[in-house]
């Protein structure tokens, strides 16, 4: 150090540590090979490895592959940083009804409300629109500021009614998403470190390239670093990120080097079998009759509950994709839950599964 | 000076198991992921995996996981491969080479290490 | 796996010329910007070294006259004035996808 320098400055001498001037204090010196977590570290812990592109450094400091959003319904919602997997999310006019780790595993499209019924909720990427009786006397097109106004961001205009919820097989349960904490818990991540004031000051995209020598020392700026398509995951293991390259398949959040790519279904089509961070079969979306009704949840696993019309209608659901193949799971994560409200116009336990029979007709799912 | 030294040639038998060893020096070992490459008589060169030897992470090629087992001694800064299963087509030489933080190229390589695999 | 196709295979040339490899991947190597990819030189009983990486970027150490050019999917390594040491083979590496993969390599050879 410049013998002029204040004593301070050279940081006691101590060759462990560098002066940063930007921020004017002593900060530790991460050992080559080590990436700062921060501007300033200021202990080893403050240190992390490099992992490799689309890979992120998890809690566990592990290397994980971040997912990827190359399915057509799925947009990035954030980036694959340092430190947290990419996430992906249904694309504008598409709501997830079974979500993945990082992503969604089935996407469908919002709702349009059938006649008699008009908007209470517009759809968003989590859910979906929800449908509220048009009240007595009022033009049902316009018994809203919703219903009078263009499609909001999170909607896309439909000349005819869009499936409200897919039918599965002959007893077909309705979609419930499920592992809705284990994404939010992932997405909480995200604020760790890329974006706090002590992360590094690089944008949480940067897959840390920079350096292109060894680490030079006391740079600090030395992670561990994983290979592309793949991210530091929670156990600070190099993981590989998710693909999303089959036709049916799109991009919902990019594999980030601490994130993982995530994926969901193309627009058109639902998820039928659900992957980490991904769909494993997705199938062409069905159609449901204009008297199926959305109601609000309480639940953040639910996307929409569905109310029954008033008695002596009945819905009618097309229970089979139009590729004729039925989605495979009936299982009670994604079954139908019927609210309080809707146990009153039907004789069925509240919270107990409700299926479409063959004929559209409620029928309670033993799970 | 960073240092790669790689144990010596070794002949086995179909089936059989062998070792490799890649002792480090002159460098925070830890800190480094540690690949492994494998260069076939008269061939071209393919990517058997890494290891980060700070935690012990690995990658692998797929077309060697089940057979290759990398690991890493912190104390000895020494970097291991063992494949197992030995068959005629792995006959080989085998590097290791210390991968480079930022870019993911290879900057310094061992010797190499012939391995026959001949009954 | 992303498939590195190096061509030709063989180059024949006098020392002084000027040596153009090309390294064809099956899709793009881009990232964040940078292309991950790498040249290295090998000489018999030796193992490879580093001449170029992120495509365009000369290792310390390594003479002027060899650079890298090329993004996305289509990339070469020019030696400028080939040197009699320059004779030997050279390969492509691409790291934007596990597994790693190298191309066939091409060798450089004197005419």
């Known amino acids: 150090f410049p013998q002029d320098r204040p004593f301070e400055d050279t940081c006691h001498g101590n060759p462990s540590h560098y002066y940063d001037k930007a921020v004017r204090r002593c900060c530790y010196r991460c050992p080559m090979g080590l990436f700062p977590t921060q501007q300033c570290p200021q202990r080893p812990t403050d240190c992390r490895k490099q992992c490799e592109p689309d890979y992120y450094l998890d809690e566990a400091d592990r290397c994980t592959a971040c997912v990827t959003c190359s399915r057509d319904d799925l947009v990035e919602k954030t980036p694959c940083a340092w430190n947290s997997s990419r996430v992906c999310e249904c694309r504008p006019g598409m709501f997830c009804s079974t979500s993945a780790v990082n992503s969604c595993a089935r996407c469908f499209f919002h709702s349009v409300c059938p006649a008699g019924m008009i908007v209470k909720f517009p759809g968003t990427a989590q859910k979906n629109t929800v449908c509220e009786p048009a009240s007595p006397g009022v033009s049902p097109a316009c018994a809203s500021p919703e219903n009078c106004k263009e499609p909001s961001s999170g909607t896309i205009p439909q000349a005819k009614p869009t499936p409200v919820s897919p039918a599965t097989s002959s007893a077909s349960t309705m979609p419930v998403r499920g592992g809705t904490r284990l994404a939010q818990e992932a997405a909480s991540k995200l604020t760790r470190a890329p974006d706090s004031p002590s992360s590094v000051g690089r944008p949480s995209s940067d897959p840390g390239l920079s350096p292109t020598q060894p680490c030079p020392e006391g740079s600090g700026d030395c992670r561990k670093q994983c290979e592309p398509d793949y991210y530091l995951d929670e156990a600070g293991r190099c993981t590989a990120c998710v693909s999303c390259s089959r036709d049916d398949l799109v991009e919902k959040t990019p594999c980030a080097w601490n994130s993982s790519r995530t994926c969901e279904c193309r627009p058109g089509m639902i998820c039928a079998t659900s992957a980490t961070n991904s769909c494993a079969r997705c199938v062409p979306y069905p159609i449901c009759a204009a008297e199926t009704v959305t109601k609000p949840q309480d639940m953040a696993e639910k996307d929409t509950t569905f109310e029954a019309p008033p008695l002596g209608t009945q819905p009618d659901c097309n229970p089979t994709p139009e590729n004729g193949e039925a989605p495979a799971s009936t299982s009670p994560t994604q079954s139908l839950l019927v609210d309080s409200q809707a146990s009153k116009t039907l004789p069925i336990p509240t919270s107990a599964p409700v299926a479409l029979s063959s004929t559209g007709k409620p029928v309670l799912d033993a799970g | 000076e960073v240092q790669l030294v790689q144990s010596g040639a070794e002949v086995k038998k179909p089936g059989s198991s062998v070792k490799v060893s890649c002792k480090a020096s002159?460098?925070?070992?830890?800190?480094?992921?540690m690949n492994w490459v494998k260069q076939a008589p008269g061939q071209g060169l393919e990517w058997i995996g890494q290891?980060?030897?700070?935690?012990?992470?690995?990658n692998y090629n797929g077309k060697f996981k089940g057979r290759v087992t990398l690991t890493a001694d912190k104390s000895s800064s020494t970097a291991y491969m063992e494949l197992s299963s030995l068959r005629s087509e792995d006959t080989a030489v085998y590097f290791c080479?210390?991968?480079?933080?930022?870019?993911?190229?290879?900057?310094?390589w061992g010797q190499g290490t012939l391995v026959t695999v001949s009954s | 796996e992303i498939v590195l196709t190096q061509s030709p295979a063989t180059l024949s040339l006098s020392p002084g010329e000027r040596a153009t490899l090309s390294c064809r991947a099956s899709?793009?190597?881009?990232?964040?910007?940078?292309?991950?990819m790498l040249w290295y030189q090998q000489k018999p009983g030796q193992p490879p070294k580093l001449l170029i990486y992120?495509?365009?970027n000369v290792e310390s150490g390594i003479p002027a006259r060899f650079s890298g050019s090329g993004s996305g999917t289509d990339f070469s390594l020019t030696i400028s004035s080939l040197e009699p040491e320059d004779f030997a083979m050279y390969f492509c590496?691409?790291?934007?996808?596990?597994?790693?993969?190298f191309g066939g390599g091409t060798k450089v050879e004197i005419k």
């Open positions: 080479a210390r991968r480079i933080n930022g870019n993911f190229a290879m900057d310094y």
């Open positions: 002159g460098y925070a070992f830890s800190s480094y992921w």
């Open positions: 290891i980060y030897p700070g935690d012990g992470d690995t």
């Open positions: 899709e793009s190597l881009e990232y964040y910007g940078t292309s991950l």
């Open positions: 992120s495509a365009s």
């Open positions: 590496q691409q790291r934007r996808k596990v597994p790693s993969t």
